[in-house]
């Protein structure tokens, strides 16, 4: 297989053993296309078709489609996190990728194979992704390996797991529009997070912090971890350079107010 040199950290989903696979429901009977569940899912679900709403944590778009926020979306990344993207034809968004950094080819066959059944990937004006299912047996993992733990999803009888024997999800992110040196430290952190973690679409929402940036790329006063279900995310106050300001935190029971702080 191809070398993964230069890929940076990769996420390796927890192996999907028979006990976990047994928790999958049989695949839906009527689907235009079947894809694996989002994240570290190994159960099958219906792919989203062109024009359907999508996001980082929703079902995957079908092959040949990408999940893209609407062009006039003020907060494109947030739109994808919230599932407010749309599945659009991949070729239609290729012109937006002029500034894409070269993405390394997937290990193994570079063409889309039967195993690559979740080709629908996530796009935004600030991040682009190339989604490949690669076999860890041919993918020398290096750097930080993150194991995604099983999550009981009893309502759908599914576990968030992956066939270790079959595939590992990696997500490659690159800057798309302007060079990141033109942005402030918050934007650079966001770009760095996306570029180096490479697995936004396989991470649980609480697993990564995407900083809250202003239009100039500096940190907004209030930073929060994502909420988990009904549980509010942990919030804190920072200056424009992202340095935490003492005495302004909350564990989610009450809101944190950063009124007197200046981040601009």
């Amino acid at each position: 297989g191809a070398s993964s040199a230069g890929l940076g950290p990769v996420v390796r989903c927890e192996p999907c053993d028979a006990r976990a696979l047994a928790q999958c429901a049989p695949p839906p009977a009527v689907c235009a296309e079947l894809v694996r569940e989002p994240g570290c899912g190994c159960c099958l679900t219906c792919a989203l078709s062109e024009g359907q709403p999508c996001g980082i944590y929703t079902e995957r778009c079908g092959s040949g489609l990408r999940c893209q926020p609407s062009p006039d979306e003020a907060r494109p990344l947030q739109a994808l996190l919230d599932g407010r993207g749309l599945c659009v034809n991949a070729s239609a968004v290729s012109r937006l990728r002029a500034y894409l950094l070269p993405a390394p080819p997937a290990p193994g066959n570079a063409s889309e194979s039967e195993e690559d059944r979740s080709a629908g990937s996530v796009e935004s004006p600030s991040v682009s992704s190339t989604h490949r299912v690669s076999d860890p047996k041919f993918h020398p993992l290096h750097s930080k390996i993150i194991i995604i733990k099983k999550g009981h999803a009893k309502d759908s009888q599914r576990y968030k797991v992956d066939y270790e024997s079959q595939s590992t999800d990696t997500q490659n992110f690159s800057s798309e529009s302007k060079r990141e040196t033109e942005y402030g430290p918050c934007r650079r952190e966001m770009e760095d997070t996306l570029n180096h973690l490479k697995f936004l679409n396989v991470l649980s929402p609480r697993g990564v912090h995407i900083p809250n940036c202003d239009k100039k790329g500096f940190y907004k006063k209030k930073q929060c971890r994502p909420s988990k279900g009904r549980k509010r995310g942990f919030c804190w106050c920072v200056d424009k350079y992202g340095q935490p300001l003492p005495g302004y935190t909350t564990k989610g029971k009450e809101d944190v107010h950063c009124y007197s702080m200046q981040s601009k």
Epitope: C16, A18, R19, L21, A22, Q23, C24, A25, P26, P27, P28, A29, L34, C43, L44, E114, E115, R117, H152, K154, D155, Q157, Y163, S165, Q166
Partner: antibody, heavy 116, light 107 residues
Amino acid sequence: QVQLVQSGAEVKKPGASVKVSCKASGYTFTSYGISWVRQATGQGLEWMGWISAYNGNTNYAQKLQGRVTMTTDTSTSTAYMELRSLRSDDTAVYYCARGGIVFDYWGQGTLVTVSS
Amino acid sequence: DVVMTQSPSSLSASVGDRVTITCRASQSISSYLNWYQQKPGKAPKLLIYAASSLQSGVPSRFSGSGSGTDFTLTISSLQPEDFATYYCQQSYSTPLTFGGGTKVEIK
């Protein structure tokens, strides 16, 4: 250890109904679905359908739709499969198995004979 | 429906032999294929899942390979307790379907 224990053999007349039970133990019943698979004497395996032990969702084989009903009783960790309007070609050993796409534990089987 | 075709339908082999059973799907099923062993009067037993993953407690002489439409179950060195019928099963689409079985008999 995980066990699926099925009810005893049944002899039924054509047109009648049969209800086979499958009592699960050794695991959290509601975390897994139960599938039903049958096997006519000397023949291969045929998937009949699946039921979620958590919410009762079902997925039946099209050829049995309308004749089969799968249910669960979470209070007793028991799954049931009822087959109506029995025909002679329904004579088979009926197995319950844990899981929806991979069947990692199986019951011992229940022989249902349909004969006039 | 996805039709699973197993071959051979039966084979005779001796203890210590290497045995290969093939299973072909009528359409691509990626790696969503499982193998079971069944002995007379007994329920099937899961051997291999996801085409190549060995189920816990199953001897390592059993192995599976393949993806797409063609799959293989291999017993590297046949043991007396391995004489049984073997079934493949696809879990890619509903209805889930099994192959017709391969009976491994003593030569």
